[in-house]
Structure formats: structure tokens, C-alpha cells
Amino acid sequence: FNMDTRKPRVIPGSRTAFFGYTVQQHDISGNKWLVVGAPLETNGYQKTGDVYKCPVIHGNCTKLNLGRVTLSNVSERKDNMRLGLSLATNPKDNSFLACSPLWSHECGSSYYTTGMCSRVNSNFRFSKTVAPALQRCQTYMDIVIVLDGSNSIYPWVEVQHFLINILKKFYIGPGQIQVGVVQYGEDVVHEFHLNDYRSVKDVVEAASHIEQRGGTETRTAFGIEFARSEAFQKGGRKGAKKVMIVITDGESHDSPDLEKVIQQSERDNVTRYAVAVLGYYNRRGINPETFLNEIKYIASDPDDKHFFNVTDEAALKDIVDALGDRIFSLEGTNKNETSFGLEMSQTGFSSHVVEDGVLLGAVGAYDWNGAVLKETSAGKVIPLRESYLKEFPEELKNHGAYLGYTVTSVVSSRQGRVYVAGAPRFNHTGKVILFTMHNNRSLTIHQAMRGQQIGSYFGSEITSVDIDGDGVTDVLLVGAPMYFNEGRERGKVYVYELRQNLFVYNGTLKDSHSYQNARFGSSIASVRDLNQDSYNDVVVGAPLEDNHAGAIYIFHGFRGSILKTPKQRITASELATGLQYFGCSIHGQLDLNEDGLIDLAVGALGNAVILWSRPVVQINASLHFEPS
């Protein structure tokens, strides 16, 4: 209708990076920009994804290098994290959120794909990380090894081998295990502190240089107390699980202190593993009963999990695996290991800014049934798995509904702001829920809409539209881009209109009648009034139309609803040659060229396209007869 197709601004980018997957218009003190997501962008050797800022009129795009943002205190894996897969602008302060839903971090032998987002302020500076699903690893441990180095230990090299082998089993790194070693006999010394080394390689190297310090006495209580009061303090981390491994070959010369020392360790929640080396006793034919009782007393309860004894120093190698396994069985404490909570949540798969924070879709949460998390300045709200049971029953828990594939919100005059989320795989047909979130981690689900067709991906795209700009939502549009019709993936957009408190189904938007795949409804954008009739409008993308070249459809708003027939269909081929997947993302909230008209930004594979609005001339014809 009034979108100019003759002089678009086609901004080129990398096709392999999928530059254009997401687009957002951006305003900084009157300067207009396009923010473009490229979720497969490479940074160094890693395919992290990234975000570009592109000037609207002329000039080249600049990479924001958000892929270089690192989280401290985690062993992160940024390769394939898909930064820019979702973008959400905050019109209040012109900041935006760029998400990396496949950002993952190492926890023990696993990688947890919790996802994370970067908040970027209005002048394109990174301001903070948003990662509500990020939890401490179960391997967030401070381990202090308390080594008896008294004269009776022989040969020392066997103790060293044990130390090196056990260290190789530890997941040492930021957010995971730290190791410190103290050696004792008559005195106690730090061999190295908890925070001295940050990798297995470095710790093993340091351990290989520990020499036996000797001593005629074995002051085990002193060694344990030194570890508790000093070694865990120097470089110890708040909230880390404290683990102590005591290795000794004889009764302590300070056993009357053990009661108090162990009480204090208990008070500090130090889990103690104790290894009795019986070499000295066996070499001299001494009964080790008193010694073994002492070591069992030192070990945390139950003994069968925390106490070890070996015939001699050489046999230490035989307990390496068992000791390692027992320490890491702490990972599974109070946990059903066959089930995932937020570990694979992929938070930030979708994002939406609300007044008090941001909603993040987490499709992988709760065994890929999905969830919606909220991050606010006051903290985060993570609804419990049980909160969703009303609409996502237990019997369908293994279906992978992907709730949070898309998130948005609506405003009703009665209920205020209500959140909306899509679950395109729910029971194979898809579902959309409208809900409010509570700080006690529960939800109130007000309404649910279900898809009609298996595999249609109903709810993979949702947009709310305030047609008349009165602050109350009039229409909710739900895309089912894989809707199969007439032998093709045609796609469908369902229209729901707000009647009192409920959204009522009111037909579908019409697409064109081509006989190829289209995926109409892959993207749906509520845009500000394009045709200057004072009603806000809607643009729908069909990126597979015209043999994957893509097309967009413009639908006009009218009197609290949406006209279901498109006023304009713009195909990629009209605009430029070689465009592909045009319409995969759409945004239209700003006048980009200062002509008083709202312009459109449309993403394509390797391109971002700006379409300029043209003025609409209203001609009012009137007939005047003379003489009357």
C-alpha cells in the first residue's frame, strides 16, 4: 500500500553468520540505528554469534563484540551459544537485551546449557549479564587435602602419585573445584592455597613438586584445624561445599584435641574424607585398631562413604577412583539425576521487556517442557515445575512442549498486564498460555489456546496489538508457521480479540495462494501506524515464500481489530536480487528517516532491509453544483 519497494536500504552482512536473523530499530538521542542479530557469527575460533549496530542512512555496520563478554567464576562454553537469537528493546531507556540461549557452562562432566543474555545500554555499551537460570555447579567445591608428611610415611613418591592421580579426577576451574594442600607432621604448612591454581594442569604441576617435610610427631588434629581455620579461608569461596581429605599413617600425637577440632569442622560444614595408610603398622606387625578407630572418628559419617584404608603407601593408587566417585556423588545430593530442572533451560530463546524487568523464554527447562523466567531489578522469579501442571499435565511431561519458544504480554483493563507464552510442541499441536507470575514461584494461568494441527508449531510466534493506542491490548495474534495445507507448509496466523477478560478466536489472517512452502507467521510484528489512519498495524513474515526468497504481508488495524486481508504484500524479489528468508524478523516502531512516517526493518539471511513509508494522500471528493 504505502511502503516504498523501489528504494529500500539493503544492509549486507554475513550469510554464514545469519546476519538479519533478528532486527530491532534503535534510537539514541535522535540518531537512528538498526540492531541486527547474527547468531552464527564467529569471534576468534568460536561461533558465538554477535550483534551489529547499523546506521540507518549510510555507512557500514559495526560488530558490538558481545560474544567476547565473559562470566566470571564459571567455566563457560561460548561456542554455538547463538548470541542474537533473540533481541528485546526497552523503549523506556532505549537499552536492549541480546540473548545467547545456547550459552553453556561446565559442571563436572556435563555442560549445562542455561543460556544467558547481555543487557546493552542506549549507547551500545554492555552493562550487565542476565542469567537467571545459572545455578552453582554441584562441583562448586573447595577441597583441602591434609597430607601427613611425618617421617614414618615411606616412600613419599607413592603419596605424590596418589595426590596427582586424585587431582586429575577433579573438575578444577572457575565455578567448580578449587584445591589447596597442607602438609603436617609436628608443624603444618600450606603447600598451596585454594585460589593459587585454576586448572588441573597447574595444580598437578604444583603437586608434583611437594616434598616430604618430615617430623617425629603426627599432629593430625593440628593439621585438620589448620585446614579448617586457615586453608579454607585463604582463597575459599562463599557458598562452596567444603571438602577435606586427610591422609595419615598413624595415631595422632594430639588426639585429645580431635573432639573439638571435629566439632568445629562439623559446625563449618566440612565434609571429611579420611584415608588410613597402614604401611607403618604392617611393616612392624602392630595392631592398627586404635589408629583405624581414630581415622573413622575423623571421617564424616557414615564411615562407609568417607573412610578408606590401604595396606601401604603403594596401595593408595587403588582408592583413587573410589574416592573421586564418592566426592562427586555429592553432586547428586537430593537430586533426581534422570530429570533436568534449569540445567538445559536455554534461557533467552525468546525475550520480552515488561515494566519491571524482562521475561525470558526457557524452552529447555523442566525436561524441555519449557518455562518462562523473569528477571527484575529486585531479583528473579523462576516458577516451579508444578506451577505449569494445570495446562501441562504430568502425563505429557516427556513430550517437550517448548514453553517459552516465544514470550510477550497483553494488557487488559481488568487484569492489567498478563504474560503470554507459546509452547509450539505441546501435545504435538501447540499451546499458548496467558498467565501472571507470583514472587512465591507460582503462576496463575488465566487462559490457554490450543493449536489445531499436529506439527503446525502453533504458538511459535505471538504478538499482542494495541490497535487504537489506548494502552489496552485489542488483538492477540498467534502464528502456526508450519501449518500444512494444500500439500505445503503454508502457515497460519490466528486472530484472538479481547472481549472483557478473555481472548476470543476471530478467524485467521489471509496469505497469498502460492503452491510452495511459505511459513506464513514465522514472524509477526505489531508496528506503529504505517498508513496514517491512527490505527496501529501488523506485519507478518513468510520467509519461505517464492522459493525461500521470502515475503512480508502488511495488515491494517481498524477500530479495535485487524483487517484480515493484507493491504500490501512485499516480496524479496521486488526489492533486490539474491535476498533469502526475507521476513524472518520484522520491527517497525520508529521513523528512521525523519519524515514523520514509521519505517520497517526486515531481516533476511545475511541482510537487513529498511523499507520506507510513503505519505498517504487522502483525497476527499465533493461535488458542488451551481446553480444549486
Partner: antibody
Framework: EVQLVESGGGLVQPGGSLRLSCAAS????????IHWVRQAPGKGLEWVAS????????YYADSVKGRFTISADTSKNTAYLQMNSLRAEDTAVYYC?????????????WGQGTLVTVSS | DIQMTQSPSSLSASVGDRVTITCRAS??????VAWYQQKPGKAPKLLIY???SLYSGVPSRFSGSRSGTDFTLTISSLQPEDFATYYC???????????FGQGTKVEIK
């Protein structure tokens, strides 16, 4: 030769205070445990208190808890028993003794004792 | 707290007699039980440690044994210098708390 010598005993009024000393020689107090044991006239042995000199951990019998304080000065190789709020029933000969790993946690060396009399 | 009940409280014996003194612990304890000899006006002397080990310099007629919670001091052949009061003492494991028995006075018959 290991030796323990107590001093500081004497006559004191009820409610009064006294400080007993136990000077050790022939071994290092730093790596030892010292116990105080008392014996009321014509009665048996009663354990009073103990200290681990290097860790400063202390233990007390219920009868003296809150009134007596055991301490050690390793530089002087001497242990002390500060006795406050003394009562008539605290009248006894007070012995200090070494508690040793080498005798499987028995009191292997004792001092000669010092008499404390609490009377008005 | 563990109580050590010593019996008898006194006994009369003749030189050459075999004398047995028993201490019963109120609950199961470790073998950290010692026996002491005390003569009037003197400090106690260690005889037996770890229930059955003879302390250095102590004559071999003294011996100790354990049976469950019962600990026994035996003087195989009483000598004139053995007339004294004998005490058992138990050490609480892994602490410095100790308990004495009430004592057994061995007198000349």
C-alpha cells in the same frame, strides 16, 4: 629428666582467688597436655582441668567450670590454674601432671602437689 | 559422662598374696585406661597404661587386663612396698576429659 613443680598454694578465704603455677622441665610444654588433679584431705583423686598448650583447647570438671581457668605460657614452660570464687570444698592438694601420647594418654609424670586451704 | 566404679574400696592382704582390683566403666570405652599407685603424702605414680601395658620401671608383678567394660589390675605377689591406694583412670577418646575411680586401699592383713 622430666619434672613438674607446683607452687602458689596457701590459705585463702571463701570467695577469694589464688593462682597456682606448674613449672615444667625436661620436656617442651608446647607439645604437651597438662592436667590439674586435686585430692581433698582423706579423699580420692578428682580431675579438675586440662590444657593443650599449642592449641589452647581447655577442658574443665563441672565442679569448677566458670570459676577456674587453666592457661599456659610456653615461653616460660609453665602452666597455671587461676582459681576464683573459692569455696571450702575446693580445699585440697592440687597436682599438675603431664598427659602423654607415649603412655597412651595416661598421666605419666606428676608434681609433688601444693596445698590449697579455703577457710574463714 | 562415663563413670568408673572401682571395687573393692579397700582390702586387706598379706605379702605374697595375689590381689585383684576391678574398675567397671558405665558404658563401652576405649582401652585408654590407666592404673596409678599412691602412697600417703605422695603424688600418684603410673603403673599401667592402655589397659594392659606396663609403664617403664614398674615391676612385672603388676599387670592389667580388659574384659568388655571391666578393667582389672592384678598384683601377682603382693610386696611390702605395694601397700598403698590404687586408682583407675579412664580417658575419654579424642578429648582431654578424664575420670578417676574412687580408689582401693590395700592394707596389711
Amino acid at each position: 629428666e622430666v619434672q613438674l613443680v607446683e607452687s602458689g598454694g596457701g590459705l585463702v578465704q571463701p570467695g577469694g582467688s589464688l593462682r597456682l603455677s606448674c613449672a615444667a622441665s625436661g620436656f617442651n610444654l608446647y607439645s604437651s597436655y597438662i592436667h590439674w588433679v586435686r585430692q581433698a584431705p582423706g579423699k580420692g583423686l578428682e580431675w579438675v582441668a586440662s590444657i593443650s598448650s599449642y592449641s589452647s583447647y581447655t577442658y574443665y570438671a563441672d565442679s569448677v567450670k566458670g570459676r577456674f581457668t587453666i592457661s599456659a605460657d610456653t615461653s616460660k614452660n609453665t602452666a597455671y590454674l587461676q582459681m576464683n570464687s573459692l569455696r571450702a570444698e575446693d580445699t585440697a592438694v592440687y597436682y599438675c601432671a603431664r598427659y602423654s601420647y607415649y603412655s597412651a594418654w595416661a598421666l605419666d609424670y606428676w608434681g609433688q602437689g601444693t596445698l590449697v586451704t579455703v577457710s574463714s | 559422662d562415663i563413670q568408673m566404679t572401682q571395687s573393692p574400696s579397700s582390702l586387706s592382704a598379706s605379702v605374697g598374696d595375689r590381689v585383684t582390683i576391678t574398675c567397671r566403666a558405665s558404658q563401652s570405652v576405649s582401652s585408654a585406661v590407666a592404673w596409678y599407685q599412691q602412697k600417703p603424702g605422695k603424688a600418684p605414680k603410673l603403673l599401667i597404661y592402655s589397659a594392659s601395658s606396663l609403664y617403664s620401671g614398674v615391676p612385672s608383678r603388676f599387670s592389667g587386663s580388659r574384659s568388655g567394660t571391666d578393667f582389672t589390675l592384678t598384683i601377682s605377689s603382693l610386696q611390702p612396698e605395694d601397700f598403698a591406694t590404687y586408682y583407675c583412670q579412664q580417658s575419654a577418646p579424642y578429648s582431654s576429659l578424664i575420670t578417676f575411680g574412687q580408689g582401693t586401699k590395700v592394707e596389711i592383713k
